[in-house]
């Protein structure tokens, strides 16, 4: 039984491969799914010698490993691509790597938008 899940309607969107895939590079994504399916947000990125390279962000459809997560946290040690998911609108705006081996917690915040 699922209880009290945060409803996800919109996520931060980003696609590093936007030109090749002919999509927008960044913005907001409105999540659409089937009835009785939960919706989540996700972020994926690479870490090359401490430099964070964002791969994709957006909506992620019904994945039990994402249930009941308020924050986007990855804990895998050294994957080729880091992945995290969460529930709640725009919960993928910031994302965290919290390594199992007791290394430093690293949270990635979006840069502040420049005033117009």
């Amino acid at each position: 039984s699922g209880r009290g899940e945060a409803e996800t309607r919109e996520c931060i969107y980003y696609n590093a491969n936007w030109e090749l895939e002919r999509t927008n590079q960044s913005g907001l994504e409105r999540c659409e799914g089937e009835q009785d399916k939960r919706l989540h947000c996700y972020a994926s990125w690479r870490n090359s010698s401490g430099t964070i390279e964002l791969v994709k962000k957006g909506c992620w459809l019904d994945d039990f490993n994402c249930y009941d997560r308020q924050e986007c946290v990855a804990t895998e040690e050294n994957p080729q691509v880091y992945f995290c998911c969460c529930e709640g609108n725009f919960c993928n705006e910031r994302f965290t790597h919290l390594p199992e081996a007791g290394g430093p917690e690293v949270t990635y915040e979006p840069p502040p938008t420049a005033p117009t």
Epitope: F64, N65, A74, T75, E76, F83, C84, E100
Partner: antibody, heavy 119, light 107 residues
Framework: EVQLLESGGGLVQPGGSLRLSCAAS????????MAWVRQAPGKGLEWVSA????????YYADSVKGRFTISRDNSKNTLYLQMNSLRAEDTAVYYC????????????WGQGTLVTVSS | DIQMTQSPSSLSASVGDRVTITCRAS??????LNWYQQKPGKAPKLLIY???TLQTGVPSRFSGSGSGTDFTLTISSLQPEDFATYYC?????????FGGGTKVEIK
Amino acid sequence: EVQLLESGGGLVQPGGSLRLSCAASGFTFSNYAMAWVRQAPGKGLEWVSAISVTGGSTYYADSVKGRFTISRDNSKNTLYLQMNSLRAEDTAVYYCARHGSGTRAFDSWGQGTLVTVSS
Amino acid sequence: DIQMTQSPSSLSASVGDRVTITCRASQSISRHLNWYQQKPGKAPKLLIYEASTLQTGVPSRFSGSGSGTDFTLTISSLQPEDFATYYCQQSYSTPWTFGGGTKVEIK
């Protein structure tokens, strides 16, 4: 290295109870949903139950609903399966399995513990 | 519940053979289909997830394809360590269900 170690299996009479445990190590247990999958002797795999990262969402196969309860203690890195009103058809090897990150699959499994229900 | 039907239930093959196992879902499951390998007395091991993505560390001779209701696991050149039972599993909706298994035996 990811390790899942089940314990608590054994011989029990029909109508009896058992509690299985799965001790997890080598990964951040609290960041992964977990499941129990069973395999009757000489048969295929059957998903039994699953629990979300916080324990806030739990799901059961119809065959065990109302008799089995899944739970987790993230402070002890341990997954549990409380099995009540056991029947002969519950006889199986019970595996603890981890839900992979971004895979929608069981990416790590324990070696299993045998539960035998017989009089 | 979604029923998963695997075929064949068993097959005999030789080292170096190309082996194909099929899995059919009773309704569309998009690409939410996983493949596992199990050897006698051992726990299952994830080979392929989301129909075609190879799990880290799995040899490239294993491949998966399909979407909707029909899926295929292919072993391009069977090796001695590949003799085992293979299961498909849908992760589209609970209850998550497995196919009946395909036992790959030595000819």
